[in-house]
């Protein structure tokens, strides 16, 4: 579960994230699995690691193996493995499968293409966009932030897409270029304004003092597979990373579950040993999508013992 | 409670240079993108881009592609804007403002921004010959 | 770029009024709308996030609707302290753009 693959060509910069996740604060050693060497930290070096981040500026084919991220807090240790290949580039146009990325599915009303990885990188807009090797030209091709849009998509725009950026280090450039299929499909899918299922608008939550509590978020976003939705919670409209409280995390659920046809994403936010002070604090379940955003609020009140009256 | 201070006003010659600090203090650093946004004296608001303090990627507003720089120091928690060329018509406030953003879950390079919620005092620029 | 245009672009009211500012998108920014208020000297607020949500700490008073092009930011009873210039400001797509503003002023 916390091994990662990752994959890129020589000579272009490849930005590896640890799998296991940490706050900012933790530190995060790196190691060249297969000897446990240490991994440095000194930007002089072509290979080093920033954090969660271990980056090849550029990437040689020797770089391949496995690597080991551990993250260390003050009460826990984490340790992730990243399984890195590095590839030597084709001469032809052909980009071999296991250099692909997950493949997207568009329709008429949703064409939207993004460019894998982007954001491990620091990059400028515009993106540069290319299907089969050819640079996309027109006025129906968009390049949008970190994705490309196609106006009016036929079923001939089905292909391969690449995505060519600099990623910018201390002053250095450096290409990386990331290639995913596009199909087209047929219009049956289709996305809605979030709704949220649980929890209730201004829901009060018993809960007992001194006992675990979980909340779950659950909203439905349309029919088909929601590749632009997301749900969270926020504590005092507060991100729940930011709010510095370990005992107050959230959770995942199943990546999209469905319900009456509609596919839905849910978030558990896991209490531990709730104190008298989780019940002054607001708790926002936050459902969104291109459409918007839905905020359904809730509150915590202690559980009363039940009275036994003679 | 989140913080950003920012630098101290500058005066500049037309095409000089100048650049804007801005540090954060009291929350998590990197989990938040930072918009720059200026305003004219009398003038209403204006983006100039924004910068993502994890990875570093930023998105400039074309208005400004060449002329404007924004880097980081997670090390200080504290961003850049680095504005080149300058002209009288640069002459403003110049504030960065934290941009709430949200990951879709399926697509997690996908970011939603939904709203500057705090901002720094704002740096005063003058650029007069 | 999308333009957002708001109106009026001043606005002479009493307290205890109710007042309405509208924004236009110039395309569809579904609900990825904020309201920001801003008063001489100093740096913008936060009110309202994605059409309709109340920023944390902001009175009831204020409220967002609308979706799609057209948004309106409503003051349900104006105290002292509303007179201030508004800006509206959509995050659907980059660059990010700003209403041209609402001056509130007190009548």
């Known amino acids: 579960k916390f091994s990662k693959q990752s994959w890129g060509l020589e000579n272009e910069a490849l930005i590896v994230r640890c799998p296991r996740q940490g706050k900012p604060s933790y530190t995060v050693d790196w190691y060249y699995s297969q000897t446990n060497k240490s991994i440095p930290t000194q930007e002089r070096n072509r290979v080093f690691a920033s954090g969660q981040l271990l980056k090849f500026l550029p990437a040689a084919v020797a770089d391949s193996g496995i690597y080991t991220c551990i993250v260390r807090s003050p009460t826990f240790n984490r340790t992730g493995y990243a399984n890195v290949t590095i590839y030597k580039k084709q001469s032809d146009c052909n980009v071999p499968d296991y250099l692909m990325y997950s493949t997207v599915s568009g329709s008429e009303k949703n064409s939207k293409i993004y460019c894998p990885t982007i954001d491990l990188y620091n990059w400028t807009a515009p993106l540069e966009w290319f299907k089969n090797c050819q640079a996309l030209q027109g006025s129906r091709y968009r390049a949008h932030k970190s994705f490309l849009v196609i106006d009016n998509v036929m079923t001939e725009d089905a292909g391969d897409y690449t995505c060519k950026f600099i990623h910018n280090e201390n002053g250095a450039n450096y290409s990386v270029t990331a290639t995913r299929s596009f199909t087209v499909k047929d219009e049956q899918g289709f996305s809605l304004f979030p709704v949220i299922g649980a929890p209730a608008q201004n829901e009060i939550k018993e809960v007992e003092i001194g006992k675990n509590a979980n909340l779950t978020c659950s909203a439905c976003f349309g029919k088909g597979t929601q590749f632009l939705a997301a749900v969270l919670w926020q504590l005092n409209g507060t991100k729940i990373t930011d709010f510095g409280e370990p005992r107050i995390q959230q959770e995942e659920g199943q990546n999209q579950s469905f319900s009456n046809g509609l596919a839905c994403l849910d978030m558990v936010l896991r209490i531990a040993d709730v104190k008298e002070e989780d019940l002054l604090l607001q708790y926002d379940c936050l459902a969104l999508n291109l459409h918007g955003l839905r905020r359904h609020t809730v509150r915590l009140s202690r559980k009363n013992p039940i009275d036994h009256h003679s | 409670q989140v913080q950003l201070v920012q630098s101290g006003a500058e005066v500049k010659k037309p095409g000089a240079s100048v650049k804007v600090s801005c540090k954060a203090s009291?929350?998590?650093?990197?989990?938040?993108?930072i918009s720059w946004v200026r305003q004219a004296p009398g003038q209403g608001l204006e983006w100039m881009g924004r910068?993502?303090?994890?990875?570093?990627?930023?998105v400039y507003a074309q208005k400004f592609q060449g002329r404007v720089t924004m880097t980081r120091d997670t090390s200080t928690s504290t961003v850049y804007m680095e504005l080149s060329s300058l002209r009288s018509e640069d002459t403003a406030v110049y504030y960065c403002?934290?941009?709430?953003?949200?990951?879709?879950?399926?697509?997690?390079?996908?970011?939603?921004?939904?709203?500057?919620?705090?901002w720094g005092q704002g740096t005063t620029v003058t650029v007069s010959s | 770029d999308i333009q957002m245009t708001q109106s009026p672009s001043s606005l002479s009211a009493s307290v205890g009024d109710r007042v309405t500012i509208t924004c236009r998108a110039s395309?569809?920014?579904s609900s990825w709308l904020a309201w920001y208020q801003q008063k001489p000297g100093k740096a913008p607020k936060l009110?309202?996030?994605?059409?309709?949500n109340l920023q944390s700490g902001v009175p009831s008073r204020f409220s967002g609707s609308g979706s799609g092009t057209d948004f309106t930011l409503t003051i349900s009873s104006l105290q002292p302290e509303d007179f201030a210039t508004y800006y509206c400001?959509?995050?659907?797509?980059?660059?990010?753009t700003f209403g041209q503003s609402t001056r509130l002023e007190i009548k």
């Open positions: 403002a934290r941009d709430t953003s949200i990951a879709a879950r399926l697509n997690p390079d996908y970011y939603y921004y939904y709203g500057m919620d705090v």
């Open positions: 009291g929350g998590t650093f990197s989990s938040y993108a």
């Open positions: 910068i993502n303090p994890n990875s570093g990627g930023t």
């Open positions: 395309q569809s920014i």
């Open positions: 009110l309202i996030y994605a059409a309709s």
């Open positions: 400001q959509q995050s659907y797509s980059t660059p990010v």
